[in-house]
């Protein structure tokens, strides 16, 4: 909201850098047959580039990413058969970020 | 992506807590009647509740919020000339979080 001038600190730009975000696992694991009885955990932390740049024509983009496999436990019930799975979900962490022109292709390292 | 079992650590739940997020200061927040201006900074950091809970029927919600006024610069363009003004934007930081039933009304402290 916009107020009259009060004891307000100057706003600092949220610089382009990695921040901790929450990645939802369950949605990506749920199958169309709705066979999932239990998926754990439902979400995990990932590192992602966020923030803004000095110019509207550039965007905060990852310059270095790392794939991190994590183990998810899952019970599916298919035709009365409980299937106990330990599945590996590969998460993508951003390690470094940069303000890049929108047209630039995103590198994957 | 879901893969076969590799050297994967067990996935840890992203618990319900405050995390740093990026809040975009939209021009509409400053002045809805005028389009000929810029806002600086375009985005700031805020603290927000995120993560997931032990149950699908509960959500990670703030139990305590704090309003934080910050000073932004509004650069108006009048007859090709920049006019510098200061405006106050009130940001909302979440100070504490709790997994609450979805129906529960969100308290604002």
């Amino acid at each position: 909201s916009l107020g009259s001038l009060t004891i307000a600190e100057p706003a600092m730009i949220a610089e382009c850098k990695t921040r901790t975000e929450v990645f939802e696992i369950s949605r990506r694991l749920i199958d169309r047959t709705n066979a999932n009885f239990l998926v754990w955990p439902p979400c995990v932390e990932v590192q992602r580039c966020s923030g803004c740049c000095n110019n509207r024509n550039v965007q905060c983009r990852p310059t270095q990413v790392q794939l991190r496999p994590v183990q998810v436990r899952k019970i599916e019930i298919v035709r009365k058969k409980p299937i106990f799975k330990k599945a590996t979900v590969t998460l993508e962490d951003h390690l470094a970020c940069k303000c890049e022109t929108v047209a630039a292709a995103r590198p994957v390292t | 992506s879901l893969g076969s079992l590799t050297i994967a650590e067990p996935a840890m739940i992203a618990e319900c807590k405050t995390r740093t997020e990026v809040f975009e200061i939209s021009r509409r927040l400053i002045d809805r009647t005028n389009a000929n201006f810029l806002v600086w900074p375009p985005c700031v950091e805020v603290q927000r509740c995120s993560g997931c809970c032990n149950n699908r029927n509960v959500q990670c919600r703030p139990t305590q919020v704090q309003l934080r006024p910050v000073q932004v610069r509004k650069i108006e363009i009048v007859r090709k000339k920049p006019i510098f003004k200061k405006a106050t934007v009130t940001l909302e930081d979440h100070l504490a979080c709790k997994c609450e039933t979805v129906a529960a009304a969100r308290p604002v402290t």
Partner: antibody, heavy 116, light 107 residues
Framework: QVQLVQSGTEVKKPGASVKVSCKAS????????ISWVRQAPGQGLEWMGW????????NYAQKFQDRVTMTTDTSTNTAYMELRGLKSDDTAVYFC?????????WGQGTLVTVSS | DIQMTQSPSSLSASVGDRVTITCQAS??????LNWYQQKPGKAPKLLIS???TLETGVPSRFSGSGSGTDFTFTISSLQPEDIAKYYC?????????FGPGTKVDIK
């Protein structure tokens, strides 16, 4: 350490309902299911059904399908099993157990006696 | 439902004896079988999962083997504290089913 603590002994009349609670501690409650198993006096073990502590999904043994309801309350890490239309042959010790592909931790059991 | 049978229904053996219990499933259950020990007035205790995996803290004198329809549970050297009833349980299909149990006591 992992613990499942059940509610106390119940004496019920035929036709009544009973609700047994099972409070879990010492582990991440939502990461497992809770199974309910009963044992009539001097008899073997009989699986009644289970509930996913995270999303409340249930699966009941056909025998109990119409009479049992399993629920979960994650604010207190407690699972409940309600059995309706009690008959004398429902007299048994009712156990809750933490469940994955095995029942690795069990409650102490709740004796339910159905008698007129 | 998958029927589980156990034999013998009861047995008496001396301390130090090797004790073997068999469990048979009415259909192929692969290795989806657990073994439990239950002492009088107590809750069952998981001893072996996945037909042959010994649970943490369970003495090594207990072992399990088998797959498909035929399974074996062995106590290599019976101890006085092993007096209990032993149950097999399948988790291949719902509903999960238990064997009728084998009561073990000491001569």
């Amino acid at each position: 350490q992992v613990q499942l603590v059940q509610s106390g002994t119940e004496v019920k009349k035929p036709g009544a309902s009973v609700k047994v609670s099972c409070k879990a501690s010492g582990y991440t409650y939502g990461a497992y299911a809770i199974s309910w198993v009963r044992q009539a006096p001097g008899q073997g073990l009989e699986w009644m059904g289970w509930i996913s502590a995270y999303n409340g999904n249930t699966n009941y043994a056909q025998k109990f399908q119409d009479r049992v309801t399993m629920t979960t309350d994650t604010s207190t890490n407690t699972a409940y099993m309600e059995l309706r239309g009690l008959k004398s042959d429902d007299t048994a010790v009712y156990f809750c157990a933490r469940a994955w592909n095995s029942f690795d931790y069990w409650g102490q059991g709740t004796l339910v006696t159905v008698s007129s | 439902d998958i029927q589980m049978t156990q034999s013998p229904s009861s047995l008496s053996a001396s301390v130090g004896d090797r004790v073997t219990i068999t469990c048979q499933a009415s259909q192929d259950i692969r290795k989806n079988l657990n073994w439990y020990q239950q002492k009088p007035g107590k809750a069952p205790k998981l001893l072996i999962s996945d037909a042959s995996t010994l649970e943490t803290g369970v003495p090594s004198r207990f072992s399990g083997s088998g797959s498909g329809t035929d399974f074996t549970f062995t106590i290599s050297s019976l101890q006085p504290e092993d007096i209990a009833k032993y149950y097999c349980q399948q988790y291949y299909n719902l509903p999960f089913t238990f064997g009728p149990g084998t009561k073990v006591d000491i001569k």
